[in-house]
């Protein structure tokens, strides 16, 4: 799977995490910080 950083167009997309662009899947993906979950790392669960 080809991975790169998300474009500046997606700034602010991942609230508490790192935005990764999964090129082959045509998807942006949020890698959440510890304690956060949700598609956009918007939920704190600890």
């Amino acid at each position: 799977v080809s991975i790169t950083k998300c474009s500046s167009d997606m700034n602010g997309y991942c609230l508490h995490g790192q935005c990764i662009y999964l090129v082959d899947m045509s998807q942006n993906y949020c890698r959440c910080e510890v304690g956060y979950t949700g598609v956009r790392c918007e939920h704190f669960f600890l």
Epitope: T4, S7, S8, D9, M10, G12, Y13, L15, Y21, V23, S26, Q27, N28, V39, R40, E42
Partner: antibody, heavy 116, light 106 residues
Framework: EDQLQQSGAELVKPGASVKLSCTAS????????IQWVKLRPEQGLEWIGR????????KYVPKFQGKATITADTSSNTAYLQLSSLTSEDTAVYYC?????????WGQGTTLTVSS | DIQMTQSPSSLSASLGGKVTITCKAS??????IAWYQHKPGKGPRLLIQ???TLQPGIPSRFSGSGSGRDYSFSISNLEPEDIATYYC????????FGGGTKLEIK
Amino acid sequence: EDQLQQSGAELVKPGASVKLSCTASGFNIKDTYIQWVKLRPEQGLEWIGRIDPLNGNTKYVPKFQGKATITADTSSNTAYLQLSSLTSEDTAVYYCVRSGTLFDFWGQGTTLTVSS
Amino acid sequence: DIQMTQSPSSLSASLGGKVTITCKASQDIHKYIAWYQHKPGKGPRLLIQYTSTLQPGIPSRFSGSGSGRDYSFSISNLEPEDIATYYCLQYDNLRTFGGGTKLEIK
């Protein structure tokens, strides 16, 4: 199956306003950005702006600032494009487009005709 | 705002031939460019994203390349169904479409 269902065709008089809707099914709009795009056959595709439904933040192309207002209602999973002070230049097909979890998933488009 | 200059605005080519369309960005867009096909009465169809990544179901006759400010899109072995208008889209910083290229068959 993910879908973006746009409202039906509109015939509106010059000077009036119109509000177009884009209702998502199969996914939560809060997980995405919703973009709006204008298509006129001779002028081509133009990006109008976008909204982040999670917080309501919007971005517009300067050309459409004051002409277009993008809003979202997360309770109904719907995004809106309001166009004001309509002229013949606003006659076009308007598309809502989802980006974020999936690259650029388009609605079917709404035809807006401005005519007296 | 990033501007996208697409050329040519129209072109005519023979069946079985090859055409190339270019888009030049007003600044480096870091390969964040997509290419769309549009036919009258239909919605735009995504062909390629991230410069060269073909979407599922898109024939390998379509290809893209480039970096920095300069990008190109090619169709080889032209077929009648390729008659359409093609647009580039930068999505590095917000979004901007190119002006479009209308493709006709000789």
